[in-house]
């Protein structure tokens, strides 16, 4: 059998393999050692017994989408049946005091690979033996502690494969410079040690995307905006636009990035090198926001010019390019810059909102029949912008962290936006008061610290804004 027979549904085309050469990966035309690595079809009954105590699930994730030329990283995590975990030696053990369907296990080990490898024979002086090899026959790399790595992962994409020895989690990074744009499929098959051979325990696949567009996300936030995710914002208050470029491999780290904004309100184009920008809309309505991100990124470099002719030497002549259709020469150090672009577009709605709220006066309400340890205080509040429909007060400790009391109530305010909010305080002391005025789209906050005196006629109320 060949790798593509084992790993894929269909043999990849020569076109696909030629157009997507991955550095350090091998052609899936290579032979697969089925004696050492048995191949089971989906639905084969042997899968049921491939792992003690249930099935192992492999979870494959990637940091896709990847800008062409950058690295994309794939991570495989093995999820063991309940109560099982990998220990520091790479053995699979039962978690202490964990009950599964079989109850508590007397044997601490699910798989004690250390014990097996210590009494393993048939090895030469290098610790290498005929079974410490990958499915294509390549020997395992002898990193320190390689014996604690008991899983073999075979990654397969674009007609090529990559083999890795690992523990219950592995990561593989692939450079996408030679990958065709668009969605691609990554498939991973996982084997575990089993005596002098290996047993398949899981298969998983995931789609990843290689793109020529810089992946761009924009977060929009605004003080007093009630719902930041509905793309409705308030007039006359700055909106903060923060651009996040999805670049997990830091491909654009050394690039100068330009942000070109059009806010759709006839204020023209705004070009910035800062990923954060503020903009204030002064009219109500619906506006089309457009952002173009431009970055000079490393791109494909032309091959170096041929060296000048030398005096003839008895060396074999090289045929024209194409004689070896799968030959790849070394990539030189040139830094060939090309412009990459990313785009973001959003439609945002601008409405009236409460822009500002201020407490202009606080008054101790003298009660004819004072309650025990209870004070009533009036807060005289003004606001700017639209008319609020509700008022909320949160009374908390002086650090403004421990809430003692929260009250919200509807409110009817005149055009002048002047209202009095009366609240009760239990006992004397210093309080933090958060006062919020709200309507459908906005929520404006002000805070103050007040000192409530003892119930002594001579004492007065103090407010520190």
């Amino acid at each position: 059998k060949r790798f593509h027979d084992v790993l894929g549904n269909e043999r990849p085309s020569a076109y696909m393999r030629e157009h997507n050469q991955l550095n350090g990966w091998s052609s899936d035309e290579n032979d697969w050692n089925e004696k050492l690595y048995p191949v089971w079809k989906r639905g084969d009954m042997r899968w049921k017994n491939s792992w003690k105590g249930g099935r192992v699930q492999a979870v494959l994730t990637s940091d896709s989408p990847a800008l062409v030329g950058s690295n994309i990283t794939f991570v495989v995590n093995l999820v063991f049946p309940r109560c099982q975990k990998e220990d520091a030696n790479g053995n699979i053990v039962y978690e202490k005091n964990c009950r599964n369907e079989a109850g508590l296990s007397a044997d601490p080990y699910v798989y004690n690979w250390t014990a097996w490898s210590e009494d393993s024979d048939g090895e030469n002086g290098t610790g290498q033996s005929h079974h410490n090899v990958f499915p294509d026959g390549k020997p395992f790399p002898h990193h320190p502690g390689w014996r604690r790595w008991n899983f073999v992962y075979v990654f397969h994409t674009l007609g090529q494969y990559f083999q890795k020895l690992g523990r219950c989690s592995v990561r593989v990074s692939v450079n996408t410079a030679n990958v065709t744009l668009g969605p691609q499929l990554m498939e991973v098959t996982v084997y575990r040690r089993h005596g002098r051979a290996y047993v398949p325990i899981a298969q998983v696949k995931d789609v990843y995307v290689v793109t020529d567009q810089i992946p761009v996300f924009v977060t929009m936030s605004q003080k007093n905006d009630r719902n930041s995710s509905d793309e409705t914002f308030l007039k006359d208050l700055p909106i903060t636009f923060d651009v996040l470029i999805h670049d997990p491999s830091h491909f654009l780290n050394y690039s100068t990035i330009n942000y070109k904004w059009s806010f759709g309100d006839n204020t023209g184009l705004f070009v910035s090198i800062n990923h954060t920008v503020n903009h204030t809309y002064v009219l109500n309505g619906t506006f089309s926001l457009n952002l173009t991100v431009k970055a000079a990124a490393p791109g494909p470099c032309p091959p170096p010019p041929p060296p000048p002719p030398r005096p003839p030497k008895p060396t074999p002549s090289l045929g024209p390019a194409g004689d070896n259709p799968l030959g790849l020469s070394e990539i030189p150090d040139e830094n060939c810059q090309i412009n990459r672009y990313g785009h973001f577009q959003a439609t945002i709605t601008i409405v009236e909102g409460i822009l500002e709220v201020n407490i202009i006066q606080t008054t101790d309400v003298l009660m004819l029949v004072p309650g025990p340890d209870s004070s009533l205080i009036d807060f005289v509040v003004t606001c700017q912008g639209s008319i609020p429909t509700e008022v909320c007060t949160i009374i908390s400790d002086p650090t403004c962290e421990i809430t003692q009391n929260a009250v919200c109530s509807p409110v009817d305010v005149d055009e002048m936006c002047l209202l009095t909010v009366r609240r009760a305080f239990n006992g004397s002391g210093t309080y933090c008061v958060n006062l919020t005025l709200g309507d459908d789209t906005s929520l404006a906050l002000t805070s103050t610290l007040i000192s409530v005196p003892d119930r002594d006629p001579a004492s007065s109320l103090r407010m520190a804004n």
Epitope: S13, E18, A177, G182, G299, S329, I331
Partner: antibody, heavy 117, light 107 residues
Framework: EVKLVESGGGLVQPGRSLKLSCAAS????????MGWVRQAPGKGLEWIGE????????NYTPFLKDRFTISRDNAQNTLYLQMSKLGSEDTAIYYC??????????WGQGVMVTVSS | DIQMTQSPSSMSVSLGDTVTIPCRAS??????VNWFQQKPGKSPRHMIY???NLADGVPSRFSGSRSGADYSLTISSLESEDVADYHC?????????FGSGTKLEIK
């Protein structure tokens, strides 16, 4: 809109050389392999060859590779086909085509090359 | 080299008909087959990829199918604008090869 425009064709005498150009626009030229295909009058299409993004891999149809050379200039968004020792059997319309996930997803309008004395 | 055989070289059809254009590969090419439409005096247009998938912007009356080494392009309810040459092409192996084409003509 993807656009490929060939130029450089015309009448050429047998045994002579000719260089065709293909100007690309509407896509990131440097992100794609590019290819050449020809079509003799009244005949089917024939693949000539292809070049990868950075010009390091060039594949030809075997019987043409000694006389035809494909190159590209990413800075100019241009693909080239250098043809030498032309014969009457090379009379054809020459098309440049973009190669994406599959070959030849977009084609130029073609340029006629007539080899005659 | 892999031969792609298109026979017949021309087909006479009526508007509104369902037409099936065949193509046979000389060896296994899996599903790696493209179909192209070429109107008189024009350059080819990509219609079908991977034997059965419609390329961008291609009307849904076009479809592709595969049975072993036999591939076909079907046009349901033929329209006058569909009169053209149709070429199949394999990309399983190098060199990439085309069929000789099938010309659709109106009766």
């Amino acid at each position: 809109e993807v656009k490929l425009v060939e130029s450089g064709g015309g009448l050429v005498q047998p045994g002579r050389s000719l260089k065709l150009s293909c100007a690309a626009s509407g896509f990131n030229f440097y992100d794609y392999w590019m290819g050449w295909v020809r079509q003799a009058p009244g005949k089917g299409l024939e693949w000539i060859g292809e070049i990868n993004k950075d010009s390091r891999t060039i594949n030809y149809t075997p019987f043409l590779k000694d006389r035809f050379t494909i190159s590209r200039d990413n800075a100019q968004n241009t693909l080239y086909l250098q043809m030498s020792k032309l014969g009457s059997e090379d009379t054809a319309i020459y098309y440049c085509a973009r190669e994406g996930r599959v070959p030849f997803d977009y084609w130029g309008q073609g340029v006629m090359v007539t080899v005659s004395s | 080299d892999i031969q792609m055989t298109q026979s017949p070289s021309s087909m006479s059809v009526s508007l509104g008909d369902t037409v099936t254009i065949p193509c046979r590969a000389s060896q296994d090419v899996g599903s790696y087959v493209n179909w192209f439409q070429q109107k008189p005096g024009k350059s080819p247009r990509h219609m079908i990829y991977r034997a059965t998938n419609l390329a961008d912007g291609v009307p849904s009356r076009f479809s592709g199918s595969r049975s072993g080494a036999d591939y076909s392009l079907t046009i349901s309810s033929l329209e006058s604008e569909d009169v053209a040459d149709y070429h199949c092409q394999q990309y399983a192996e190098y060199p990439l090869t085309f069929g000789s084409g099938t010309k659709l003509e109106i009766k």
